[in-house]
Structure formats: C-alpha cells, structure tokens
Amino acid sequence: RKIPKVGHTFFQKPESCPPVPGGSMKLDIGIINENQRVSMSRNIESRSTSPWNYTVTWDPNRYPSEVVQAQCRNLGCINAQGKEDISMNSVPIQQETLVVRRKHQGCSVSFQLEKVLVTVGCTCVTPVIHHVQ
Amino acid sequence: GITIPRNPGCPNSEDKNFPRTVMVNLNIHNRNTNTNPKRSSDYYNRSTSPWNLHRNEDPERYPSVIWEAKCRHLGCINADGNVDYHMNSVPIQQEILVLRREPPHCPNSFRLEKILVSVGCTCVTPIVHHVA
C-alpha cells in the first residue's frame, strides 16, 4: 500500500520540498513528541474484568526496537465474586502502528515502513451464540 | 538509536545505529489491513464497556484517518443490560507512530510522530476509599 500523494485540490506542493528519488520518501526518525509523558491510568490491566498481561517484543532491525503486546489472561471475564465467568469473553483490542524495518541485502542496507498490529488490552464482550444443527 | 548486527565481511563505515534520516520505499509492508475498526469487529457494541468511534482526519498525517474511541458510559453494562455505576468504563490508550509531512504539504518527506490514541474501553472494578 502506497502513501497517498498530496491532492492538488487541497495542497500545492511547496518549492521548499526536498528532492527525493523516485519510488522512495525521506523519513526523519527523530520522533515528534518523543519525550511526551502520558498519564495512563494505573493498573487498568489488573483491575479490568478482562485482565491482561504485557510482553515486550524486541527486534534490533526494527525502529522502535521494543513493541509491547498485551495478552488476555482469561477466556472468560472476572465477575463480582472474583471468579471467571465463561458465559462472557475476554477479547483483545488491537491497534495498528508504524515501524521502520531495516533490511540487510549483502552489504547494502535498505529501509521499509511496516504496519504492525499491536494488542493494546482486553475488553469483556457478550458472545454471539449460534446453535448448530 | 539502536544497535544493528552487521555482516562481518562488510566495510566498517556503516553506523551501528539507525541514522536520523532514512530513505524509505513508498510501499508499506504488511497487507492492506482494514483500518476502520467498525468493520473489523463489533466489540465496540458488544462490550460491557461499549464505546463510540470518532473519525479523526488530518491530511498532513499518514494514516490520515485515525479512529478514536470514547466510552459510551461512565459505568459498565450489567447482565440486565443496565449501567452499573459501581464499575468503570475506562479507555485503553496506546501510543502509536504515524508520519507527519515535514515540511508541511510535501508529498514525499515525513517525520515520525508519536500520538496517543484511545483504542477501546474496558470495564474496571475500582478500589474504594472512604475519605474521612
């Protein structure tokens, strides 16, 4: 999937745009908002009725090298008594993010943008029930 | 930056870390995924902490459309289909990387940007404190 070109209806390409070889784009990987600290709610993953654990995946040829993935702890959801209720389902919630992949071909190196699907957490859902004949 | 293992036979001039600026192929690797969460699942309706999805569009960003979740209720939906306010619907937030056109309006020049998105909601049992 290609990154869409800027539509002429909305933009005129400024003269100041850097020259870029055909079929590629210039990417500055100095991240905007890199140091922005977000105040996430504490312990949501433990207090949720569909609790989850986190696993850090690490890949030295990916930028960023660390990607955190969530896994639902249970198939069912935790009820008011703290017991698992398997009439409900814990399901993963997913979000796409971009990473830069570094590829080695012999002694040359190329860079590729890649979409990665990250599991962010879990939610408790009412299952859709089908009775099979 | 991060350290990259190198082929030992290659010249030593290569930087071990990711360079600050790279030339990247215009094609994005990894399937034409469906980025509209309304089409990919109906969890947003079936969850005990249901949410609405709001379209956030910015032509200076890739992807230009991002869907933001807003929890429908303060509490969670109980077995009777009523809102139970002793529980909380809480947004699950995630930092993601997007591309920002830099300089603005340029078709093939971008910078990575980190943004915080609410992806969905989960039902939480709060710890209760009685304030003296």
Partner: nanobody, 116 residues
C-alpha cells in the same frame, strides 16, 4: 492523600432548589469522572449524576433527568450539582464521588431534606 469537601446540603420545600458542591484536593490527578450518589435509610447507594473529566460528558439517573444539572470547574477540581424542582423522594444523604479509574474516593455525605 485525596480530600473531598462537600457543601450545600440542607432543607428545602418541594419544588425548591439546592446546589451541592464538592471540591477535591490532594493527589487528585488523572480524574476519570466526578459525580454524586445518594442513599436513603435501608437502601443501597444509587447513582445520581456524573461528569467525565476529559470531555465533560454527563450522565444522569432517569429519576433526576431534566431536573438536576452537573457541572465542573477543571481549574479548581470542583463539581457542582444544581438540583431544581426538588421532590420529597429526593430526600437522601448525597455523596460526592471522585473516580480515578482504578481507585474511587467517596465523600462523607451531605444531607438533603425535601419536605413541606
């Protein structure tokens, strides 16, 4: 430690109005929502109204919809409940609730009496 100070309770005749206020202080950051529950003797505490901190989204119990209005002041960490067209059945102890997603703080309560 979080402190909650409730004020504005009292006695009023049916059809009258009262305004309850609740101020939060201490480590009241990352607020999810702020609101009010009420309780009458021998009954469970019931939700009255709440306001989400991030976007001022409001929710009301059916029994008070159209009569009560909840509002907030972000800069002061306060929430107000304007109660109009009060009825005898609104008589209760009203509790301020500060919700931080995984932790919830309850105030000590303020008595509202509606009678002629």
């Amino acid at each position: 430690e979080v402190q909650l100070v409730e004020s504005g309770g009292g006695s009023v005749q049916p059809g009258g109005s009262l305004r309850l206020s609740c101020a939060a202080s201490g480590r009241a950051n990352s607020i999810n929502w702020f609101g009010w529950f009420r309780q009458t003797p021998g009954k469970e505490r019931e939700f009255v109204a709440g306001i989400r901190w991030s976007d001022a989204y409001t929710e009301y119990a059916n029994s008070v919809k159209g009569r009560f209005t909840i509002s907030r002041d972000n800069s002061k960490n306060t929430v107000d409940l304007q109660m109009d067209s009060l009825r005898p059945e609104d008589t209760a102890v009203y509790y301020c609730v500060l919700d931080l997603s995984t932790v919830r703080y309850w105030g000590q309560g303020t008595l509202v009496t509606v009678s002629s």
